[in-house]
């Protein structure tokens, strides 16, 4: 009888240890989940609000075809402008066509008038070639009109209807670009 009770007690203790272990694992899993959830919720909120509003672009961004554009309200140097765009999940504007250039310059005229706006174009110091930030070459009609006389790095900017060049360390507004969300409907 005593042996039977002792065996039951041992089994209960073993069960208890297993449950404690499971609880520990669950607590650890819950902590890990909470961290994942924090970022997952942020992503889902973005996705849901976009889906709910059926809006392909975030608030304060302008849409044209497959792209969304953000026109900054602050000045910064070219490299900081790029960083500011990355924070928003975008890159500096990359103008692919005359049509896109016309849309941008037309929009700028409506929004702000004739200011300077950094775009994602820079001149290679060695070869002197102009390249977009993704490494592609601009089409012949979209090369900066003037060569900057700067010994420093040279970057491209838009002003009025023109693409111009300047020392990358000068302060200008900037334009970010990201892909518009595709409607699944």
């Amino acid at each position: 009888k005593l042996l039977q009770v002792s065996t039951i007690a041992m089994q209960q203790q073993e069960k208890l240890i297993q449950q404690e272990r499971a609880l520990l694992n669950f607590t650890e899993w819950k902590r890990s989940c909470a961290l994942q959830m924090k970022y997952c919720q942020a992503f889902m909120q973005n996705s849901l609000s976009s889906a709910h509003n059926s809006s392909p672009c975030p608030n304060n961004w302008i849409q044209n075809r497959e792209s969304c554009y953000y026109v900054s309200e602050i000045w910064s140097i070219w490299h900081t402008s790029q960083e500011n765009c990355l924070k928003e999940g975008s890159t500096l504007l990359q103008i692919e066509s005359k049509e896109e250039m016309d849309f941008i310059t037309g929009s700028l005229r409506k929004i702000k008038g004739s200011y300077d706006y950094w775009v994602g174009l820079s001149q290679d110091g060695h070869s002197g070639r102009w390249l977009w930030q993704d490494g592609s070459s601009p089409s012949p009609g979209l090369l900066p009109a003037e060569r900057s006389q700067s010994a420093n790095q040279v970057c491209g900017y838009v002003k009025s209807n023109s693409l111009l060049s300047s020392n990358c360390s000068t302060w200008k507004y900037f334009i970010c670009e990201k892909y518009a969300l595709r409607s699944s409907v």
């Epitope: 970022y39 990355l86 999940g89 890159t91 490494g135 990201k178």
Partner: nanobody, 115 residues
Framework: QVQLVESGGGLVQPGGSLRLSCAAS????????MGWYRQAPGKERELVAA???????AYADSVKGRFTISRDNSKNTVYLQMDSLKPEDTDVYYC?????????WGKGTQVTVSS
């Protein structure tokens, strides 16, 4: 706390290749953009390459045509394929993530290009 772990650095001869990896502890769907930066002693960190959640890319002039950034969403990892390496590419390479207005950095991986 988001953790970024870089790997793949090492010693390579000029003209050689390396592939750096940056693994994130959270889903990279929640990350606006990820970038690779490098820093030589006594100098500021500079952007080498970046990729946004939508897949747009940006490169420093000095690496265009030689380096390629890519991402694997299923592995929560961003890669930097470095080809035609030059001695001036020698640096500590850091991974950076932009999440909802906050920046997170990895601890870095050393890349040395030398014969």
């Amino acid at each position: 706390q988001v953790q970024l772990v870089e790997s793949g650095g090492g010693l390579v001869q000029p003209g050689g290749s390396l592939r750096l990896s940056c693994a994130a502890s959270v889903s990279i769907f929640s990350i606006n953009a990820m970038g690779w930066y490098r820093q030589a002693p006594g100098k500021e960190r500079e952007l080498v390459a970046a990729i946004t959640s939508g897949g747009r890319t940006a490169y420093a002039d000095s690496v265009k045509g030689r380096f390629t950034i890519s991402r694997d969403n299923s592995k929560n990892t961003v890669y930097l394929q470095m080809d035609s390496l030059k001695p001036e590419d020698t640096d500590v390479y850091y991974c950076k993530a932009y999440i909802r207005g906050e920046d997170y950095w990895g601890k870095g991986t050393q890349v040395t290009v030398s014969s």
